[in-house]
C-alpha cells in the first residue's frame, strides 16, 4: 500500500470568515466560512 505523507514545507493558515446571509442571498443570519490558504472552502 502506498503511504501518503503531507510535507509541503510551509504552514497553511486558516481563518474563520463570517458573511451576512441577507447580503449574499435571501436568508437571515450569519454564514460561517473557512478560508484555507486564501481560498474559502466551507
Amino acid at each position: 500500500d502506498a503511504e501518503f505523507r503531507h510535507d509541503s514545507g510551509y504552514e497553511v493558515h486558516h481563518q474563520k470568515l463570517v458573511f451576512f446571509a441577507e447580503d449574499v442571498g435571501s436568508n437571515k443570519g450569519a454564514i460561517i466560512g473557512l478560508m484555507v490558504g486564501g481560498v474559502v472552502i466551507a
Epitope: F19, F20, A21, E22, K28, G33
Partner: nanobody, 124 residues
Framework: EVQLVESGGGLVQPGGSLRLSCAAS????????MGWFRQAPGKEREFVAA????????YYADSVKGRFALSRDNAKNTVFLQMNTLKPEDTAEYLC?????????????????WGQGTQVTVSS
C-alpha cells in the same frame, strides 16, 4: 469624501456601561455593513461586532456576546454600540468601519472606510 466619526468613549469603572456612536457621511449608508473593531496597545486589531446593511442581522465576537449590542439608524446614517458590564480587558481604541455589503464581516481587510477611533478605558 467619506467620513466616519466616532464618539462616546471615555473612562468607566468595571461593570459600567458606555454607548459609542459612529456618524457616517459621504457614502450610500444602506449599502454598507457597519462594523466595530478595537485595538489595544501592542495588539492586533480585533473584530467586535457588525450589523448588516438593512440592520436586520448582527454578529458579535465571542468575547463581547451578551454584553454588547449593535444597532443602526439608517435615517440618520449612524450606528450605535451599547457596551454593558465592561471589563478591564475591554480597554482599547474602538474603531468604526464600513464594508460594502456581501464581504466577510469579521476581517479588517473587508472594510473600505475607517474612523479615527474613540478610546475606551475600563479601570477602577
Amino acid at each position: 469624501e467619506v467620513q466616519l466619526v466616532e464618539s462616546g468613549g471615555g473612562l468607566v469603572q468595571p461593570g459600567g456601561s458606555l454607548r459609542l456612536s459612529c456618524a457616517a457621511s459621504g457614502l450610500t449608508f444602506t449599502l454598507y455593513t457597519m462594523g466595530w473593531f478595537r485595538q489595544a496597545p501592542g495588539k492586533e486589531r480585533e473584530f467586535v461586532a457588525a450589523i448588516s446593511a438593512s440592520g436586520g442581522t448582527t454578529y458579535y465576537a465571542d468575547s463581547v456576546k451578551g454584553r454588547f449590542a449593535l444597532s443602526r439608524d439608517n435615517a440618520k446614517n449612524t450606528v450605535f454600540l451599547q457596551m454593558n458590564t465592561l471589563k478591564p480587558e475591554d480597554t482599547a481604541e474602538y474603531l468604526c468601519a464600513a464594508a460594502f455589503r456581501g464581504f466577510a464581516i469579521n476581517t479588517p481587510t473587508s472594510y473600505n472606510y475607517w474612523g479615527q477611533g474613540t478610546q475606551v478605558t475600563v479601570s477602577s
